[in-house]
Every structure is written in structure tokens, then in C-alpha cells.
């Protein structure tokens, strides 16, 4: 039995997979910040995780997916204050009892040091200094990502 969050996540990812062959993105759109081969959009408003996921989808993007600790640190360096939290594309899958990225892959336990519980209705946020498990209903900011070409495969991280 999938939770509503898992269903929403899977639906959005399936719709994204159908469009992976659209023309590549050469430059970041206005208001988006380039970080290596990605464009990031840091929201100024707040939403629960589900709404944040949907907002990124409407922007033809996804909630942020983080490959490794190095990418995490570079992303955190763009956060201007320690009291700002941002949703990323990682939440707890109750059916698989594991942290799961919205592209379907599971978290490599070495990648992120998560502070907080791994349990139902938990989603992952990042701050300037840490990675937190928060209740998915919490209204905080979020980060969307678009990939720059030549990356044309599915969004990472790979499992």
C-alpha cells in the first residue's frame, strides 16, 4: 500500500521520464542559479513537501536530488541563513522502510547524515549546515532542479 506522497512522487516521476528526450537546457533560466551541471531554484515561499514536489513539476523540473556529500556541501553554501530549511526530493517510503529519492532510487547511507527519525510521513530538508528529517506536512521552502545538457539520462542519484 503506497502512501499518498509515494503515489504523487511516482506519478510525477513517470511523467518526467516521458519527456527526458526534450531539447536540452544550455543555460539556466532567469532566477535559477547554476551549480555545476544543474540549475537550482530556491523558493521564497513555503509549502508542505507534496506541494513543493508538484510546484517543481509545473516548472518542468524536480525537487532537488543530491548525488553525494560534495554536492550537498556546494548546495548548502548557497543557503544564506542557518534558520532556513528547504525540502529536497527525498522522503521515507513506508512500504520499503527506507529513504527513497523521487526518481525511485534509495539513499546510499553514506551520502547524507540525516538528523531525525526515519518514519512514516517524514521528508528530508536541508539547511546551511545539516540534513533534517521533518514531518512532510511542515511548510518550509524548497529547491527545484533542472539539468543542463549534455546530461540526458534520468535524474540521479543512481542506486
Amino acid at each position: 500500500q503506497k502512501s499518498s506522497i509515494e503515489k504523487c512522487s511516482v506519478d510525477i516521476q513517470q511523467s518526467r521520464n516521458k519527456t527526458t528526450e526534450r531539447p536540452g537546457l544550455l543555460n539556466c533560466p532567469i532566477y535559477w542559479q547554476q551549480l555545476r551541471e544543474k540549475c537550482l531554484l530556491f523558493s521564497h515561499t513555503v509549502n508542505p513537501w507534496n506541494n513543493s514536489l508538484a510546484d517543481c513539476s509545473t516548472k518542468e523540473s524536480s525537487l532537488l536530488l543530491i548525488r553525494d556529500k560534495d554536492e550537498l556541501i556546494h548546495t548548502q553554501n548557497l543557503i544564506r541563513d542557518k534558520a532556513i530549511l528547504f525540502w529536497i526530493g527525498l522522503n521515507f517510503s513506508l512500504s520499503e522502510k527506507n529513504w527513497k529519492w523521487i526518481n525511485g532510487s534509495f539513499l546510499n547511507s553514506n551520502d547524507l547524515e540525516i538528523r531525525g527519525d526515519a518514519k512514516e510521513n517524514s521528508c528530508i530538508s536541508i539547511s546551511q549546515t545539516s540534513v533534517y528529517s521533518e514531518y512532510c506536512s511542515t511548510e518550509i521552502r524548497w529547491i527545484c532542479q533542472k539539468e543542463l545538457t549534455p546530461v540526458r539520462n534520468k535524474v540521479y542519484p543512481d542506486s
Epitope: 541563513d81 534558520a83 533534517y132 528529517s133 514531518y135
Partner: antibody, heavy 119, light 107 residues
Framework: EVQLVESGGGLVQPGGSLRLSCAAS????????MSWVRQAPGKGLEWVSA????????YYADSVKGRFTISRDNSKNTLYLQMNSLRAEDTAVYYC????????????WGQGTLVTVSS | DIQMTQSPSSLSASVGDRVTITCRAS??????LNWYQQKPGKAPKLLIY???SLQSGVPSRFSGSGSGTDFTLTISSLQPEDLATYYC?????????FGQGTKVEIK
């Protein structure tokens, strides 16, 4: 109806300790950051500390850092402020308020509890 | 830390008057500015958030404007129950800071 009710204030000697509590009801407590704000007699408002919904993340004003500890028990819908090494300048009405992540406003406040630090 | 400066520190006006309180930040805070009302012996109450958004249940005679460093709270027609101290607050960065307050009295 959202309600925040503080308790635990009182008279304490300089160097002493006190623990304030804030009982919350009428909303999903664990989904909200919470803060403590204080007001010295006849003075303005001063933000003291904030804690994230899960309790994993905490922030403090420089004036209380290392002396005060904010915490929460989501199973009891209660916010706490442990105050150690109290000083005369900590004398104030202490309010708990809903909010604390940037850019939250404090949309609900408790009625306040008076802490007096005096010998 | 971001300093918030309100003016005037107090004012006296008649019922029905238009009242304006200003708040200046020591650096740009975009629109991350809130206004609170505190009546004597009571807890503060949120009036305006994000510089110009009226909090639910607050009378429409209250309005806010501004962005960057200069902000204004306006009471379009002062009522007896508006006797209070008004505070601005920035939520752009920690530590969260308040203005020193503006005390509004009724003539």
C-alpha cells in the same frame, strides 16, 4: 482553536535555573517550528530561541546562547525552555509563539509567563 | 544583526484619524517584514506579514507597504480599540529582530 499556554515562571536567584513549558493545542504541533520571545518590564520584544518541528534544529539569540536550551516533546504537544545561569537582565515575560523558520511570522502567541531574577 | 528602527516612538491621534508608522531596516530585507499589535497587559498579535499581507481576522483598516529597507503600517481610520503598541519585525535573517515599538494613544 489554536492555544498556547505557558507555565513555569517565577522568582529565581541570580545563577539559578528555571524550566518554562508551553502547552500547545488546536493544531498539528509537530508540523510547526516554535519560538520563545521575551519582553523585559516596560521594554520591547526580544526573540530568544527557535526550534524546528522535529526538534532537530535549534537557534538562539547571542544573549542566551550557552545558557538556555530549547526543546520539545511532540508526543505531549509541549515546548520547553531550560534556563540556566540566570541573570538580572533575563527578567521578563516569556512568550511562546508559533513560527521560527525563516520567513515565518509569529502567528499565534501564548499569554506569557513572568520570570523574575533577583536576590 | 539587522537593526529595526521605528518612528515615531509614540503618537496621539483622534478617533477616525489616519495613522502612519514607519519602520526602517539597517539593510535590505526584501519583503520579510511583519507588524504586531500589543495591547496593554496582553500578548502581541500578528497584524501584517510579508510587508503587506493582512493576517486572517484583522480589520481591513490596517494595511502595510514597503520593501527593501523602508516599511509603513497604516491605520486608515483609528478606532478606540487600536490603543496599543505596534512593533515591526524582520524575518530575513537570524537573529530575528524587532523594532523598539510605537505607542499609539487616543486623544
Amino acid at each position: 482553536e489554536v492555544q498556547l499556554v505557558e507555565s513555569g515562571g517565577g522568582l529565581v536567584q541570580p545563577g539559578g535555573s528555571l524550566r518554562l513549558s508551553c502547552a500547545a493545542s488546536g493544531f498539528t504541533f509537530s508540523s510547526y517550528a516554535m519560538s520563545w520571545v521575551r519582553q523585559a518590564p516596560g521594554k520591547g520584544l526580544e526573540w530568544v530561541s527557535a526550534i524546528s518541528g522535529s526538534g532537530g534544529s535549534t537557534y538562539y539569540a547571542d544573549s542566551v546562547k550557552g545558557r538556555f536550551t530549547i526543546s520539545r516533546d511532540n508526543s505531549k504537544n509541549t515546548l520547553y525552555l531550560q534556563m540556566n545561569s540566570l541573570r538580572a537582565e533575563d527578567t521578563a515575560v516569556y512568550y511562546c509563539a508559533r513560527g521560527g523558520y525563516l520567513p515565518d511570522a509569529f502567528d499565534y502567541w501564548g499569554q506569557g509567563t513572568l520570570v523574575t531574577v533577583s536576590s | 544583526d539587522i537593526q529595526m528602527t521605528q518612528s515615531p516612538s509614540s503618537l496621539s491621534a483622534s478617533v477616525g484619524d489616519r495613522v502612519t508608522i514607519t519602520c526602517r531596516a539597517s539593510q535590505s530585507i526584501s519583503s520579510y517584514l511583519n507588524w504586531y499589535q500589543q495591547k496593554p497587559g496582553k500578548a502581541p498579535k500578528l497584524l501584517i506579514y510579508a510587508a503587506s499581507s493582512l493576517q486572517s481576522g484583522v480589520p481591513s483598516r490596517f494595511s502595510g507597504s514597503g520593501s527593501g529597507t523602508d516599511f509603513t503600517l497604516t491605520i486608515s481610520s483609528l478606532q478606540p480599540e487600536d490603543l496599543a503598541t505596534y512593533y515591526c519585525q524582520q524575518t530575513y535573517s537570524t537573529p530575528l529582530t524587532f523594532g523598539q515599538g510605537t505607542k499609539v494613544e487616543i486623544k
